[in-house]
Amino acid sequence: LPRWRQQWSGSGTTSRFPETVLARCVKYTEVHPEMRHVDCQSVWDAFKGAFISKYPCNITEEDYQPLVKLGTQTVPCNKTLLWSRIKDLAHQFTQVQRDMFTLEDMLLGYLADDLTWCGEFNTFEINYQSCPDWRKDCSNNPVSVFWKTVSRRFAETACGVVHVMLNGSRSKIFDKNSTFGSVEVHNLQPEKVQALEAWVIHGGREDSRDLCQDPTIKELESIISKRNIRFFCKNIYRPDKFLQCVKNPEDSSCLSGI
């Protein structure tokens, strides 16, 4: 009979998790010469060490420190792109604008993007059946704590003008409870960051409203200004055209507004 397992509300560890993490690490270090020194086996050992044999509702940021140390990476000033509730477009953008970086363009974010993982207390097994759900089970689960840890570090190391892409189609364009609103905003360092520039991405083709006047954007401006960081906001009315113009800035249609 299979050993009794804690049943959580969330989906289990992503199939072939160890292999996936290692495959991604190898691929990343090959493509990024500045990370060639990274030993992927040590990265996997540190990743595993953060959650294996631990109760999956009692994970701390401290658990991930060995991994964070191994994955230390710096982004040039003015090149950090944060995002909230609009991951796909942010990633499409950095795939074209290769000198800008989201968290998922960095080693640790790249390793964990779209993956789920958890272990079990006192066993060396990975739980492929179920993992804690942030709402229904607990917030201090391996996945949530990982993203909180690496997001904090990513924000702390940002410098110059930091950009953030926000989803203008949502009821809360800026959400205080998102990772951006609860972690990244509060960990931007005023002595290193001169300004935060928000790009509000419009959803509807005919949407010509100025979403920079949205109350939640005003709330973001207030939080940022109180931290002695300047705030700017831009509407991106046509995200498709925006991406096209990043690819081909010389295109005549790109001289008009996007």
């Epitope: 072939r16 292999e19 996936t20 495959a23 190898v26 992927c40 492929y128």
Partner: antibody, heavy 116, light 108 residues
Amino acid sequence: QVQLVQSGAEVKKPGASVKVSCKVSGYTLTEFSIHWVRQAPGQGLEWMGGFDPEDGETIYAQKFQGRVIMTEDTSTDTAYMEMNSLRSEDTAIYYCTTGRFFDWFWGQGTLVTVSS
Amino acid sequence: EIILTQSPAILSLSPGERATLSCRASQSVISRFLSWYQVKPGLAPRLLIYGASTRATGIPVRFSGSGSGTDFSLTISSLQPEDCAVYYCQQDSNLPITFGQGTRLEIK
């Protein structure tokens, strides 16, 4: 411990198909991918293909593309390798293997003889 | 595709002698993902070394691996009659996984 047990030897005629099974125990197919390797008489080891978790699909060596299908039944923890349009040069021992990036574990091998 | 080239193709030595087998990669291979196998007729490949230098479970200490980047080697410090086999290097850092063409070790 990890064990891979393969199906028995097969004798096939040219043009026929063969399906080799590989039952894993000591772990489940959700943990590690299966790869297939063959060794023809007097020849070296040749990787045929295997599951790439990063792309979420099976990658085949160019040589076997379109002629080999690798599948898995996670409910029984069994992997399968089916080869079509067999020819005499496909006579070989076929191995399933697992544990990429870690310690590789191998099945005992299945001898497939293609002869008219 | 990473091509692994082994040398020599055949090595003929006496018991007690030291054997050094070479494996050269067409591009840099992460050491952790370079393995060595021993293959005897009718038997499944036996993993000797993984991570370029770590002996697999149950492998005698006379087998050792070394190297990094594009040059790797397997050394058998004191040959035994049962070491007569074909030896293959393998890389699994990239798909397709590739093997060297093998070195046949003959014991005189």
